[in-house]
């Protein structure tokens, strides 16, 4: 689009004519005020359309804005249009005139807003006051648009002075109203009863006047209404509840309870929903696998948790080999119960640096009036293994014995292993293993041996070497689940007189 | 879930350095002897270093040693291998394997793809 | 060092087949041997250890046996699931793998 003069911002003179055009490749055509005025619409032989607005016996009236765009945009790439400004100073117009709807101003939320006072000079100054005020507002003037700002629930007048005469403007109302988009929630008192309590259910709203409240829920379809109640929660501004409340409640009020709310200014609604489950009798349930055998390591703290769901709250009891434990006033052992949601709770007991007598069968019991459940496990302590006597013998057979005797539990695994190259091994060469095959130099006797009072196995291996002929570096390796531990012999041949 | 997981692969040119990670999680990593093994395009298995539970010693292929280092972390969970000077012969993918003395690689990471090229 | 070589190179087989794969080791091993299975782009994974005991989760299809020098790996009735390449690997002294044995769809 072309418009000619450019613009974008013209003065003209009161009383005269001023002819203004458009041009583009597409029918174009003037708007004022959202209207099209008269004009001469064209299209020349080279395929340009054009448009020409002939203002005639220009007023203060005409100032404003003017458009240019294309006649029918659609199909067109692109939805062009030209903005062109026209300033008609007039002495005898004052302020141009607003609608009526243009002097009230309301407000949902803080943001900037135009008070739209405009003039038809662009170089008269222009004030912002208070209706009540004579001192000027120091707010930013656009001689096009008026002032732009953030303003106050007030009345509002603009000022101008034009030759020797003070002119005042419309009074402009600013209102802010208390409108949210509307944020719901619901919550219940419970939202598991058992039949014949009490369902209580708070429906709130946050930042609006003037709401609506809409409750559905089980007893309604059934025709049995409940009266909500509805009040202002004083000490917090623009919260408003609702409350419904249905004494003696009955399996068939389980269900979903849901709450509607509606504004009118915006037109604004949000509803929520929650699940109210009303049971026969109280319940007890564990939740998720707990392993017959749990594992503790040997002075480490270790932490036992059953996750269950009970309603109404249970008590939960603790017990090692039927014994009722207790938190110790050592320290040894703590426990805890914790409420996680409405009906879900975790009840954990703490073995703090466990000792090899806290190995036993653990039970945990949660019960109330209604229901009761219980949940046993053994606990074996794990001790790491350690190497207590790696000793070599000559016995009179010949061979060699190499003997292992270690400790651990779970049971440990014994691994032998040797190296012959003493220079080079173990640093550079890894050891090779030992076994037990036909073809080996070697045999071995493994014996295992459970201790009960210190709930432990004791492992003695004797390696038999048929015939050394080198010095050998012999380790035997003990490993379990929580550890491991070599020792080191070096086996010497029968013919050498010492031993390194 | 016991797992492993390797990061650091990448393409380089030859004679610099990379710095492979394995990063261990559902088992008690300070309890395990842990080991390196590659694997060229197209080819076999070829064992390149191991190293103790503790630390306390670490064995190399022949083709690696003095250019590779293995190395761990145990309050990390954590197995490395630095590999200097490398060769267009170490391209492979390198995977991280638990093994203790006396047992077989039980668990093994998905590999991570190291490329030496100029 | 001690050398670990595989046979055959390639197998092809069909499925309800039984099939037998062999490693054998160039000094004795005693039963410190594996064997793994690899699948293209993944992992290899732990099939057998001490010559013959399963690895847990392994279908027991799978068997291994032998000591020394020589090993097998059997399949008793081939799955669709089984056709990969198969490593054997001793770790008596050091850790040396054989050369796999691809093992095909007939």
């Known amino acids: 689009l072309v418009v000619t003069p450019p613009g974008p911002e013209l003065v003209l003179n009161v009383s005269s004519t001023f002819v203004l055009t458009c041009s583009g490749s597409a029918p174009v055509v003037w708007e004022r005020m959202s209207q099209e005025p008269p004009q001469e619409m064209a299209k020349a032989q080279d395929g340009t359309f054009s448009s020409v607005l002939t203002l005639t016996n220009l007023t203060g009236l005409d100032t404003g804005e003017y458009f240019c765009t294309h006649n029918d945009s659609r199909g067109l790439e692109t939805d062009e249009r030209k903005r062109l400004y026209i300033f008609v100073p007039d002495p005898t117009v004052g302020f141009l005139p607003n609608d009526a709807e243009e002097l009230f101003i309301f407000l949902t939320e803080i943001t900037e807003i135009t008070i739209p006072c405009r003039v038809t000079d662009p170089q008269l100054v222009v004030t912002l006051h208070e209706k009540k005020g004579d001192v000027a507002l120091p707010v930013p003037y656009d001689h096009q648009r008026g002032f732009s700002g953030i303003f106050e629930d007030r009345s509002y007048i603009c000022k101008t002075t034009i030759g020797d005469r003070e002119v005042d403007s419309d009074a402009y109302y600013v209102y802010r109203l208390q409108v949210s988009s509307i944020n719901v929630s619901v919550n219940a008192v419970q939202t598991v009863v058992r039949q014949g309590e009490n369902i209580t259910l708070m429906c709130i709203v946050i930042g609006n006047e003037v709401v609506n409240f809409e409750w559905t829920y089980p007893r309604k379809e059934s025709g049995r209404l409940v009266e909500p109640v509805t009040d202002f929660l004083l000490d917090m501004p623009y919260h408003i509840r609702s409350i419904l409340h249905i004494p003696s409640a009955e399996l068939e009020d389980s269900g979903t309870y849901t709450c509607n709310v509606t504004e009118s200014v915006n037109d604004h609604q949000d509803e929520k929903a929650i699940n109210i489950t009303v049971v026969e009798s109280g319940y007890v349930r564990l939740l998720g696998e707990v392993g017959t055998l749990q594992f503790a390591e040997l002075h480490r703290s270790r932490t036992l948790q059953v996750v269950f769901e009970a309603y109404p709250p249970p008590t939960v009891l603790w017990f090692k080999d039927n014994r009722t434990l207790g938190d110790s006033s050592a320290g040894e052992i703590a426990l805890s119960t914790r409420n996680v949601s409405e009906t879900r709770y975790v009840s954990e007991l703490t073995l703090v640096r466990v000792k090899v007598a806290e190995a036993g069968h653990y039970t945990m019991r949660a019960f109330h009036e209604d229901a009761e459940v219980q949940l046993s496990f053994q606990l074996q302590i794990n001790v790491p293994v350690r190497v207590l006597e790696l000793s070599e013998s000559h016995p009179d057979s010949g061979e060699q014995t190499v003997r292992c005797r270690g400790r651990g539990m779970p049971q440990p695994n014994i691994i032998w292993s040797a190296c012959r190259d003493l220079k080079r091994c173990p640093r550079e060469l890894p050891p090779t293993l030992l076994g037990n095959s036909s073809e080996e130099e070697s045999q071995l006797e493994t014996n295992v041996t459970y201790w009960e009072e210190e709930q432990e196995f004791e492992v003695v291996s004797t390696l038999r070497l048929q015939h050394v002929d080198r010095p050998l570096s012999v380790r035997c390796t003990l490993r379990n689940a929580v550890g491991q531990d070599t020792q080191e012999v070096i086996v010497v041949p029968h013919s050498l007189p010492f031993k390194v | 879930e016991v797992q492993l997981v390797e990061s650091g692969g990448g393409v380089v040119q030859p004679g610099r350095s990379l710095r492979l990670s394995c990063a261990a999680s559902?088992?008690?990593?300070?309890?395990?002897?842990m080991h390196w093994v590659r694997q060229a395009p197209g080819k076999g298995l070829e064992w390149v270093t191991v190293?103790?539970?503790?630390?306390?010693?670490?064995y190399y292929a022949d083709s690696v040693k003095g250019r590779f280092t293995i190395s761990r972390d145990n309050s990390k969970n954590r197995l490395y291998l630095q590999m200097n000077s490398l060769r267009a012969e170490d391209t492979a993918v390198y995977y991280c394997?638990?093994?203790?003395?006396?047992?077989?690689?039980?668990?093994w990471g998905q590999g991570t793809m190291v490329t030496v090229s100029s | 060092d001690i050398q670990m070589t595989q046979s055959p190179s390639t197998l092809s087989a069909s499925v309800g087949d039984r099939l037998t794969i062999t490693c054998r080791a160039s000094?004795?091993?005693?039963?410190?041997l594996a064997w793994y299975q690899q699948k293209p782009g993944k992992a290899p994974t732990l099939l057998i250890y001490?010559?013959?005991s399963l690895e847990s989760g392994v279908p027991s299809r799978f068997s291994g046996s032998g000591s020394g020098t020589d090993f097998t790996l059997t399949i008793s009735s081939l799955q669709p699931d089984d056709f990969a390449t198969y490593y054997c690997?001793?770790?008596?002294?050091?850790?040396?793998f054989g050369q796999g044995t691809k093992l095909e769809i007939k």
């Open positions: 394997a638990r093994g203790e003395l006396g047992d077989a690689f039980d668990i």
């Open positions: 559902g088992f008690t990593f300070s309890n395990y002897g």
């Open positions: 190293i103790w539970y503790d630390g306390s010693y670490k």
């Open positions: 000094q004795s091993i005693s039963t410190w």
């Open positions: 001490k010559a013959s």
């Open positions: 690997q001793q770790y008596k002294t050091s850790w040396t």
